[in-house]
């Protein structure tokens, strides 16, 4: 039962984990535009990995695609590449798990195919988790170098006759939900591998033997080895102990509407 | 039909105050910023501030912060400009002006209310 | 704060001549977000209050004559009158509407000779 509790919390877990990557993947606020000591535009910038958008104060929003594949940062492109891997590997993930589910019966499929099945669901759903946050991470690093860089710019002189208005840009919404659905998402990688062991088969059990002693006949079976790891096979007299970690998913809020000017 | 209407102006000695006034009507007041333009006699226009419609947001010229102080009353679809410490300076057709949907531009103006800033 | 400047101060053409006037900003009016410049021209006939013309500096507010029309980027924008018209005779003034506090111009007056 703890088993399939842990297996199932895992599946779950994974599945708001991905949701969220995805969600991440396609919001646009990955960098918003710094307010603080900056000059006061009448417009509010923010940007995401595939498009950069602006608010004006009537709400009026408009965004524009990068509609170019060669002429954008290497890192960006990364990023974007981190972000798609973890979203495809998150995605079949949840396909291979939807099969392993203790719960779910699919015709005489063997517990060693579950567990393997749990195990590669597991192992997708981290890497998954590491790919996301490790693409947020890439990002919120680039935001941090650019904004020290524009701060720099702004304090030592622009240089020629005309200025430009030197944005800088700061964490957006879609970080926090991208580190928060990476991290689930590794925590339900983690979950379904536990589970894993929990439905691994037992070890090669020894076959019965009869001895036949003089004068009348006992049948001798023995039980079979079983390690006292707490993760064997979960017999009706045996029970395993379910931690039952849960996870909070705070939520990063983002007014939905700035009233910037 | 988008109207506004300034009142509030008058003669005022250097040093006084004065309360201008914009009654809006013919669109939702309260989702729309807006902003007080003046233009001395003869001379071109200045705008004087700002103000978002959530009233988050408030900005002023230079010349006049410190001194003015713009409000809204989004629940009587009114504008309010107080001015305080008025110097000759000051003297000036006001303008109440809407904030447009489309590029920050001011696409309504109302035809403005003389302000007169002398001993 | 942004200073804008227009030139020529006044300018006085014949009926259906092509003027253009010139607005230069201080700095940059261009944002690269949405590739829009936030530069507004207006028009103020005489004892009337100022009338939008144009935002984006290129857009053309409804119910404007399609002989306005505006151009430019980053710093310097042109207002075009394409057939001067007796109605045009006015005050134009430009404004940057991309850092507060916002600024216009010193207006370019049109008569008509």
């Known amino acids: 039962m703890a088993v399939t509790a842990c297996q199932g919390l895992g599946f779950v877990v994974s599945l708001i984990g991905i949701a969220g990557i995805i969600a991440a993947t396609c919001m646009d606020q990955w960098s918003t535009q710094d307010l603080y000591n900056n000059p006061v535009t009448a417009v509010f910038n923010y940007q995401g990995l595939w498009r950069s958008c602006v608010r004006e104060s009537s709400g009026f929003t408009e965004c524009r695609g990068y509609f170019t594949l060669l002429g954008l940062p290497a890192m960006l492109q990364a990023v974007r590449a981190l972000m798609i891997v973890g979203i495809v590997l998150g995605a079949i993930g949840l396909l291979v798990s939807i099969f392993a589910l203790k719960c779910i019966r699919i015709g005489s499929m063997e517990d060693s195919a579950k567990a393997n099945m749990t195990l590669t669901s597991g192992i997708m759903f981290i890497v998954s988790g590491l790919c996301a946050i490790a693409g947020v991470s890439v990002f919120a690093n680039m935001l941090v170098t650019n904004f020290w860089m524009s701060t720099a710019n702004m304090y030592t002189g622009m240089g020629g006759m005309v200025q430009t208005v030197q944005t800088r840009y700061t964490f957006g919404a879609a970080l926090f939900v991208g580190w928060v659905a990476g991290g689930l998402t590794l925590i339900g990688g983690v979950m379904m591998c536990i589970a894993c062991r929990g439905l691994a088969p037992e070890e090669t059990n020894y076959k019965a033997v009869s001895y036949h002693a003089s004068g009348h006949s006992v049948a001798y079976k023995p039980g079979g080895f079983k390690a006292s790891t707490g993760f064997g096979s979960n017999t009706k007299n045996k029970k395993i102990y379910d931690g039952g970690a849960r996870t909070e998913d705070e939520v990063q809020s983002y007014p939905s509407k700035h009233d910037y000017v | 039909e988008v109207q506004l209407v300034e009142s509030g102006g008058g003669l005022v000695q250097p040093g006084g105050s004065l309360r201008l006034s914009c009654a809006v009507s013919g669109f939702t007041f309260s989702s729309f910023g807006m902003h007080w333009v003046r233009q001395a006699p003869g001379k071109g226009l200045e705008w004087v501030a700002y103000?978002?419609?959530?009233?988050?947001?408030?900005y002023y010229a230079d010349s006049v912060k410190g001194r003015f102080t713009v409000s809204r009353d989004n629940a009587k679809n009114s504008l309010y400009l107080q001015m305080n410490s008025l110097r000759a300076e000051d003297t000036a057709v006001y303008y109440c002006?809407?904030?447009?949907?489309?590029?920050?531009?001011?696409?309504?103006w109302g035809q403005g209310t003389l302000v007169t800033v002398s001993s | 704060d942004i200073v804008m400047t227009q030139s020529p101060d006044s300018l006085a053409v014949s009926l259906g001549e092509r003027v253009t006037m010139n607005c230069k900003s201080s700095q940059s009016l261009f944002q690269s977000g949405n590739q829009r410049n936030y530069l507004t021209w207006y028009q103020q006939k005489p004892g009337q209050p100022p009338k939008l013309l144009i935002y984006w500096a290129s857009t053309r507010e409804s119910g404007v004559p399609d002989r306005f029309s505006g151009s430019g980027s980053g710093t310097d924008f042109t207002l075009t009158i394409s057939s001067v018209q007796a109605e045009d005779v006015a005050v134009y003034y430009c404004?940057?509407?991309?850092?507060?506090?916002?600024?216009f111009g010193q207006g370019t007056k049109l008569e008509i000779k």
């Open positions: 404004q940057n509407v991309y850092i507060y506090p916002l600024t």
């Open positions: 002006v809407r904030s447009g949907y489309y590029g920050q531009s001011l696409d309504y």
């Open positions: 103000i978002s419609s959530g009233t988050t947001n408030i």
